[in-house]
């Protein structure tokens, strides 16, 4: 069952709901965090809970079984079904933006490739709700700084269209 905190605008699909493999991660984040890094998975998008659960499993399988990571790299994944999928969550250090930024940021990744199109309005609302939720829960500072993945590493992520979009979000700061 999706859990919805009263302060959150969008429900978060817990790991057991999307049948995640057990995490082997141990490094904790020091909350509240000052940074959020937005990326895209650059793979397939999904627009139903069933297909997004499968996509979250695919990403996690690649990260754990191919790359040898302790879990899916992202703290949260965003589906075009308008739902947020719990990755490492608020408390564990991700593997999304390199060694410099991982320990001091939350990594949220939109499932899909956003070089040539923007995510659905539902996905955008879900991400914005998650960020509001993070502030309300004390996981993010109220003056947190939002960055695109390409602002912190040499990459095309989060894709041209999504990158242009997040540059208009209130907490975005350029490199």
């Amino acid at each position: 069952q999706e859990t919805e905190d009263p302060a959150c605008c969008s429900p978060i699909v817990p790991r057991n709901e999307w049948k995640a493999l057990a995490s082997e991660c141990a490094q904790h984040l020091s909350l509240p965090l000052r940074y959020v890094v937005v990326s895209h998975t650059a793979g397939s998008s999904c627009n139903t809970p069933a297909s997004c659960q499968q996509q979250a499993r695919n990403v996690q399988h690649y990260h754990m079984k191919t790359l040898g990571w302790c879990d899916v790299g992202y703290n949260f994944l965003i589906g075009e079904d308008g739902l947020v999928y719990e990755g490492r969550g608020w408390n564990f250090t991700g593997a999304h933006s390199g060694h410099l930024w991982n320990p001091m940021s939350i990594g949220i990744s939109f499932m899909g490739n956003y070089m040539d199109r923007v995510p659905t309005p539902q996905a955008i609302r879900a991400a914005q709700g998650l960020l509001a939720c993070g502030v309300a829960q004390g996981a993010l500072r109220s003056n947190y700084v939002l960055k695109g993945h390409r602002d912190v590493q040499r990459t095309l992520s989060p894709g041209n269209q999504l990158y242009h979009l997040i540059q208009n979000w209130p907490h975005y700061r350029s490199p």
């Epitope: 390199g98 060694h99 410099l100 590493q153 040499r154």
Partner: antibody
Framework: EVQLQQSGAEFVKPGASVKLSCTAS????????IHWVNQRPEQGLEWIGR????????KYDPNFQGKATITSDTSSNTAYVQLSSLTSEDTAVYYC????????????WGQGTLVSVSA | QIVLTQSPAIMSASPGEKVTITCSVS?????MNWYQQKLGSSPKLWIY???KLAPGVPARFSGSGSGTSYSLTISSMETEDAASYFC?????????FGAGTKLELK
């Protein structure tokens, strides 16, 4: 919080060897490269070499090949550099630093260890 | 080995003054990193991948350049910016640093 904690100062005689340690907290060294860099008194920075603790792969600057040996122990999240046949020219502060496997910059640095070589 | 030549070696600037430190490269590289070091402390990553600011670095700092010429600029010098700055390149295990620029407060 990410930290690289280095061992204390070493005062040694010419010809001796010394082994310096660098213990990481806040991250797993297996997910990074650990580098060693030195800084002679009033001088610039020189890269010595690095280790990939996930597989013990090492690379060295040619100037330090034979002088430095870098190792790691993932169970204690610690990297080491052993410096051999020390001379006064090796007197310097030695820093460990960490980098992502896919990035080309040193994200975090230890506080440094002074090695002083004198008869 | 790729040689990085920094200039000037030492400079002083007044608060509010614009400061530019340059790093010339003996053969073309794709990006440059910069570290700040204060007396008695270890270096800190300051600017990486030519123009990206490390977390917590004030926005008055910027980095630019390409090929064989790179620079670090402070738009308006502040007291806390007095330090040594080192450029650094890493290309296929030719990792080298510049000799450093000592920036003093005038």
């Amino acid at each position: 919080e990410v930290q690289l904690q280095q061992s204390g100062a070493e005062f040694v005689k010419p010809g001796a060897s010394v082994k310096l340690s660098c213990t990481a907290s806040g991250f797993n060294i297996k997910d990074t490269y650990i580098h060693w860099v030195n800084q002679r008194p009033e001088q610039g920075l020189e890269w010595i070499g690095r280790i990939d603790p996930a597989n013990d792969d090492t690379k060295y600057d040619p100037n330090f090949q034979g002088k430095a040996t870098i190792t790691s122990d993932t169970s204690s999240n610690t990297a080491y550099v052993q410096l051999s046949s020390l001379t006064s020219e090796d007197t310097a502060v030695y820093y460990c630093a960490s980098s992502d496997n896919s990035d080309s910059w040193f994200a975090y640095w230890g506080q440094g260890t002074l090695v002083s070589v004198s008869a | 080995q790729i040689v990085l030549t920094q200039s000037p070696a030492i400079m002083s600037a007044s608060p509010g003054e614009k400061v530019t430190i340059t790093c010339s490269v003996s053969s073309s590289v794709n990006f440059m990193n910069w570290y700040q070091q204060k007396l008695g402390s270890s270096p800190k990553l300051w600017i990486y991948d030519t123009s990206k600011l490390a977390p917590g670095v004030p926005a008055r700092f910027s980095g630019s350049g390409s090929g064989t010429s790179y620079s670090l600029t402070i738009s308006s010098m502040e007291t806390e910016d007095a330090a040594s700055y080192f450029c650094h390149q890493w290309s296929s295990y030719s990792l080298t640093f510049g000799a450093g620029t000592k920036l003093e407060l005038k």
